[in-house]
């Protein structure tokens, strides 16, 4: 840490004869340089040298040939590698004065003649006198302003909006300044700051814009920082609104995006007089092309139950925006002849959910739906299997005998979605068959005794079971089951020796 | 040939309307952002209005806001200025001109010949 | 709005003379500057983007220089065509904004 440089000569403030020429030394651990009251047009006579001594300190020497009132101010002597664009200088200073009868008041540049308040805050008027003897006054519309003053400075104070005079007085004759204008500024302690990108999804070719909003604030500097930046990308706008309060509106503009512009998008308001700082992100994807994905919440096969409501959902990716539209065994879903509605919802910017809802669902509802999204650039597409579930149901039960041989036959038709298992039992003793206990699942296996199943169609099944004897009348039960429900019939099968009896009787 | 044309000034009474053309040709015009600007008898250029290659993006001067709509159809290549409310300070030249990114800064690369646009009563 | 400001407003000049415009802008601005020509009776044409680059097509006499506030467009060596009227315009900033022009005359 260096200790701060030295000024010979060694005094706060020093007041130099008009015309005269006078000289300041600095002296620092490091190389030092000046700053002074005027700027480098003006300085003409302003000369600056380095000199060496054996002391083994940087030693740099100001010069002024003739001073004026100009040179009245205050002059800094700094390192040079602590000099930062953001902070007040650090380093020594001495004030200078140059008293000039004719020159009562340091000259201003014309900026120094707007003097912007932030709402009730104080300010300096900064009419400095060249001569620290030299009383002054402050003056404005109404008369006399009671204000402090240092006449290193100016007035300070809390000051309302309008033009104000300084008055000076030297050896009987009076000056006047040209009016400062007092220009009061809204500006709150905190920013409120606002960022909107309508869009944050882009192709290439599209132009991206982003738009940060400050509110209730006028004293404002705001910076983007954005991939494009580097590329001289970008065009920015401010535009002010005053009604109903002030809103300070930056728009980004960013034409013919590719790529390359992907990326966070930064806003960063810092009010300019006070260490306010606020800042605001928003992520912009830039694609080469449209894009679309497709994500369903169910498999390729789905099975809905008879009457039953239910609801498909397939969540779809996309940009730009995508046309939805659905078909069933490739024909467009026409909605209004049957009880299946389709819709599209935007979840956000680039996400949308379509449903296919069925409302009660019916066997002729069983198909392949697919659903297809295009946009522009792309085209996708999911297919699914639809089946209707019904319950199974015995359509028929019938026997057939063999003639002769005492052989039968009984037949068992039943449907349903999923296709019936079938399976058979049989009661010998007929007069117990009401007592399920004397039923008895028939095997395969069995001697003498066939089974067999046959698919009719998708959802029809008939089953077989042949006897090659029948010596006694028995009870068979067809049993036709899937996973909603169960039906069964029951036949007689009376042996051919008593079917010729009854049929002498 | 890169190429802008545009079309549609004439003589117009204070307040009324006009529409100006610009064909474009030689590009792909839905690639670039257009803009419109006019220079007055003996004076300088002065920048309109801008709009973006898809055209989901306009920007207008403050002098015609509200007043001017930019437009255009990039399947026929064409951009459009409607101009309403006319003033007399509104008597130009108008050039339609390509906006163009260079690396570190945006030109008009390419102007129309311009289309005299007279408000007089 | 930024403002720009060009100097001198017109200068009379000789073929094979060396002629210095300046464009300052009232806020920085980087090297977002372009520079046009413009003919009596014809559309303006690009000269020179991003303050110091030659558009294609521009004979080399045309030069530009500068950043920040403060450009330069010099022509080395006069030729007949070249008197003409010279307009900077800042990119950076909707709206964009052109100088007053600089009238190049035969002297």
């Known amino acids: 840490q260096l200790s701060l440089p030295s000024i010979l000569p060694n005094e706060n403030e020093k007041v130099v004869q008009l015309n005269s020429s006078f000289s300041l030394r600095c002296f620092g651990e490091s190389e030092v340089s000046w700053q002074y009251p005027m700027s480098e047009e003006e300085s003409s006579d302003v000369e600056i040298r380095n000199e060496e001594n054996n002391s083994g300190l940087f030693v740099t020497v100001l010069e002024v040939s003739s001073a004026s009132a100009a040179h009245t101010g205050l002059y800094t002597c700094y390192y040079n590698h602590t000099q930062t664009e953001e902070n007040e200088l650090e380093g020594r200073h001495i004030y200078i004065y140059v008293p000039d009868p004719d020159v009562a008041f340091v000259p201003l540049g014309m900026t120094d003649y707007l003097v912007i308040v932030e709402d009730d805050d104080s300010a300096i008027i900064p009419c400095r006198t060249t001569d620290p003897e030299t009383p002054v006054t402050l003056h404005n519309s109404e008369g006399v302003v009671p204000a402090s003053y240092d006449s290193r400075q100016g007035f300070n104070g809390t000051f309302t909006v309008g033009p104000y005079i300084c008055e000076a007085t030297v050896k009987g004759k009076k000056f006047q300044t040209i009016p400062f204008n007092v220009y009061a500024l809204k500006a709150t302690s905190e920013l409120d700051l606002e960022m909107e990108a309508l869009k944050t999804v882009y192709k290439s070719g599209e132009t991206i814009v982003v738009t940060c909003a400050v509110f209730n604030n006028e004293v404002v500097d705001l910076q983007w920082t954005y991939p494009g930046e580097v590329k001289g990308k970008g065009i920015t706008m401010l535009e002010e609104i005053k009604v109903p309060s002030i809103k300070l509106v930056y728009t980004l503009t960013v034409p013919e995006a590719t790529v390359k512009d992907s990326g966070d998008y930064e806003c960063a308001a810092r009010q300019a007089t006070r260490e306010v700082k606020e800042m605001k992100k928003v992520t912009i994807s830039v694609h080469e092309k449209g894009f679309i994905e497709i994500k369903p919440t169910f498999s390729q096969l789905e099975a809905v139950n008879l009457h039953e409501v239910k609801h498909f959902v397939v969540e779809v990716r996309a940009y730009p925006p995508p046309r939805i539209s659905w078909l069933k065994n490739n024909l467009t879903l026409i909605e209004n002849l049957t009880e299946i509605t389709t819709d599209v919802e935007k979840i956000q910017e680039i996400r949308y959910r379509s449903k296919l809802k069925l409302i009660r669902a019916k066997e002729e509802d069983s198909g392949h739906y697919t659903i297809v999204a295009q946009n522009e650039d792309a085209v996708k597409s999911y297919t699914f299997e639809l089946l209707t579930q019904v319950p199974s149901s015995i359509l028929d039960l019938v026997d057939d005998h063999h003639g002769s041989t005492g052989g039968q036959t009984v037949r068992c038709t039943a449907e349903g979605t999923p296709l019936p298992d079938i399976e058979w039992m049989i009661c010998k003793d007929i007069k117990k068959c009401n007592n399920e206990t004397s039923w008895t699942i028939l095997a395969n296996n069995v001697s003498n005794i066939i089974t067999e199943i046959h698919s009719r169609d998708r959802s029809t099944v008939e089953g077989r079971v042949t006897f090659a004897k029948v010596e006694e009348t028995i009870a068979v039960r067809c049993l036709a089951k899937n996973l909603l429900g169960a039906e069964n019939r029951e036949l007689k099968l009376v042996a051919p020796t008593l079917r010729s009896e009854l049929t002498v009787a | 040939e890169v190429q802008l044309v545009e079309s549609g000034g004439g003589l117009v009474q204070p307040g009324g309307s006009l529409r100006l053309s610009c064909a474009a040709s030689?590009?792909?015009?839905?690639?670039?952002?257009m803009n419109w600007v006019r220079q007055a008898p003996g004076k300088g250029l002065e920048w309109v209005s801008y709009i973006s290659g898809s055209s989901t993006t306009m920007y207008y001067a403050d002098s015609v806001k509200g007043r001017f709509t930019i437009s255009r159809d990039n399947a026929k290549n064409s951009l459009y200025l409607q101009m309403n409310s006319l003033r007399d300070e509104d008597t130009a030249v108008y050039y339609c001109a390509r906006l163009r990114h260079f690396d570190w800064s945006y030109a008009f690369d390419i102007w129309g010949q311009g289309t005299m646009v007279t408000v007089s009563s | 709005d930024i403002q720009m400001t060009q100097s001198p407003s017109s200068v009379s000049t000789s073929v094979g003379d060396r002629v210095t415009i300046t464009c300052r802008a009232s806020q920085g601005i980087s090297s977002w500057l372009a520079w046009y020509q413009q003919r009596p009776g014809k559309a303006p044409k690009l000269l020179i983007y991003?303050?110091?680059s030659l558009q294609s097509g521009v004979p080399s006499r045309f030069s530009g220089s500068g950043s920040g506030t403060d450009f330069t467009l010099t022509i080395s060596s006069l030729q007949p065509e070249d008197f003409a009227t010279y307009f900077c315009q800042q990119a950076t900033s909707f709206p964009f904004t052109f100088g007053p022009g600089t009238k190049v005359g035969i002297k």
């Open positions: 030689g590009f792909t015009f839905s690639s670039y952002s």
């Open positions: 991003a303050a110091s």
